[in-house]
Amino acid sequence: KEWQCPRTPYAASRDFNVKYMVPSFSAGGLVQTMVTYQGDKNESAVFVAIRNRLHVLGPDLKSVQSLATGPAGDPGCQTCAACGPGPHGPSGDTDTKVLVLEPALPALVSCGSSLQGRCFLHDLDPQGTAVHLAAPACLFSAHHNRPDDCPDCVASPLGTRVTVVEQGQASYFYVASSLDAAVAASFSPRSVSIRRLKADASGFAPGFVALSVLPKHLVSYSIEYVHSFHTGAFVYFLTVQPASVTDAPGALHTRLARLSATEPELGDYRELVLDCRFAPKRRRRGAPEGGQPYPVLRVAHSAPVGAQLATELSIAEGQEVLFGVFVAGKDSGPGVGPNSVVCAFPIDLLDTLIDEGVERCCESPVHPGLRRGLDFFQSPSFCPNPPGLEAPSPNTSCRHFPLLVSSSFSRVDLFNGLLGTVEVTALYVTRLDNVTVAHMGTADGRILQVELARSLNYLLYVSNFSLGDSGQPVQRDVSRLGDHLFFASGDQVFQVPIQGPGCRHFLTCGRCLRAQRFMGCGWCGNMCGRQKECPGSWQQDHCPPKL
């Protein structure tokens, strides 16, 4: 039998301790929120908020401008000054809770924890390829805001998620805020609301539609809004909340809330429980049927998928899929599974399940005892009755009221538990060629870029590297600009190429040339690198013979 070279073990063909230096920016304080802007004339910016300050950066992470957003009551607060001479309420630090782009004219909108959670609109001022912020406009009309009815009170100090949708020329802000009794009593933010920005940017139109946790549940029933996004005809919010109103706080679970993006109303507000599980290939004795539940969503991102993953998920290439990183939760007992799992929920399937749930509630024969749910938002009732009514009313439609769909949507970990002890804290999914890549930040300050594939029993890494020496968790917000992603960790913002930071972590030629084409790796004498790093021969097709 002919002698063969011994095979290099897979793990020995790469080194994840290789240091990669990626561009970074020190913000001078813990990064709170971050958003990117790409104009149509090649101008772009990264907006980074820390306590009392908003930084404007170029795409290279060089500082372009800095704006004081607090403390409220301080003469140096530049945004506060836009509201005219005060006083405007209690003084104090401003933590930026919302940073979104208003696309039409275009402008940046920032909303903070101070000044009743009001927002400021900053017109974008392109100067060459850089972007500056014009003087802020105060989105607050004193005459139509009262403590019990405040259309211009947007941000909650406990957290707020906003998605901006253009309907015609109007900009509608879909707002979801975490509340407690104290916050609810102070200028009455709502749990979920849809607010129209007035054309003259003098604030938000009064008479907006909203849902709020009922006063009697505010103490025990808290909803954390993890993510929001707009795709197709809907806006979606992802929440972590108590599974039961009566047992709250109790065990937590994850829900998806769906709102119409074409009609600014909440009659067709729907919720669906998302169930993510780890189902090992070989089930241990005593392990739960259907897999180990991971009920608590940590981070989420929606993206169109590449051909390979689409085939595995039985959907068409390019279809939008919601990806979520889930953890087991505090009360799950001693875990034998991984710390984090990743589940994929195709949006079309989510919509179908919601629509079927509406049919079950509203089309006869209705299953007796089927509850409308959402008892923390509305009076309890059974389908098909409207909330608070014991019988259907002839002039109200069952469909025109909020509903919790009676079934949940269950998926299993895409990574088959292979994330192991890794604690994922940030997620952004991209499609590169026909491949779908999950870009993940971790609790110990690393970036993992991994191909998403269901059928493998190992992880297909694009990269796995440390952002620096601080080891601080990577934060939830991730933004994209061109071919780069921007991650925040501690007081730093990092620019990470979508195709990975480099190829040096591949140690063997064979492993190097098997890297995905989009990475641009080739063998370069005795190392794996990109063509521009290789002064001599660079080979993407053949390895030199092993001696």
Partner: antibody, heavy 120, light 107 residues
Framework: EVQLQQSGPELVKPGASMKISCRAA????????MNWVKQSHGKSLEWIGL????????SHNQKFKGKATLTVDKSSSTAYMELLSLTSEDSAVYYC?????????????WGQGISVTVSS | DILLTQSPAILSVSPGERVSFSCRAS??????IHWYQQRTNGSPRLLIK???ESISGIPSRFSGSGSGTDFTLSINSVESEDIADYYC?????????FGAGTKLELK
Amino acid sequence: EVQLQQSGPELVKPGASMKISCRAAGFSFTGYTMNWVKQSHGKSLEWIGLINLNNGGTSHNQKFKGKATLTVDKSSSTAYMELLSLTSEDSAVYYCARWLRRGGYAMDYWGQGISVTVSS
Amino acid sequence: DILLTQSPAILSVSPGERVSFSCRASQNIGTSIHWYQQRTNGSPRLLIKYASESISGIPSRFSGSGSGTDFTLSINSVESEDIADYYCQQSDSWPLTFGAGTKLELK
């Protein structure tokens, strides 16, 4: 002194297109948006759309989408409106008017207007 | 679109009289209403912004009031130079809209 100087009157043939200008002086041009307003003979005012003089962002009245294209040249502090495929319905006086898009401001300065006549 | 209805279409006054123009919005627009004067062959001129805020250089005889859907422009002692068309305009919602106008003429 704030001034909005519009180009002179125009006689154009049906089917043609034309570009009218509004040159600004006496204020920080890029801090504002420029509105365009139509007034047909003996009629009221109709808002066509506006352009952010800073970043070129626009908002149109749907009625004029495809009829009016708004542009800006920051170097000459001039806003432009191109009117496309003109018909007799487009015969009117067209005004530019500056506006700071934020609470507390309205269209405080107007150009002198340009009379457009569409006739063969 | 928000419809602004101005009434009356024509107002006939004598110099020195007090006169009021009405503007009604088809929905609540807070105080996002502005008033303009347009003399014959002239450009519109801003008189009042945000329902009641005065404009520098505009005579103090012009005043405005109202909020929600009903708004009023008043001239407390009409002078001959006030003969013109008067328009209200809303900035609450896109598209921005104007009323049909009220013509002020001398008796």
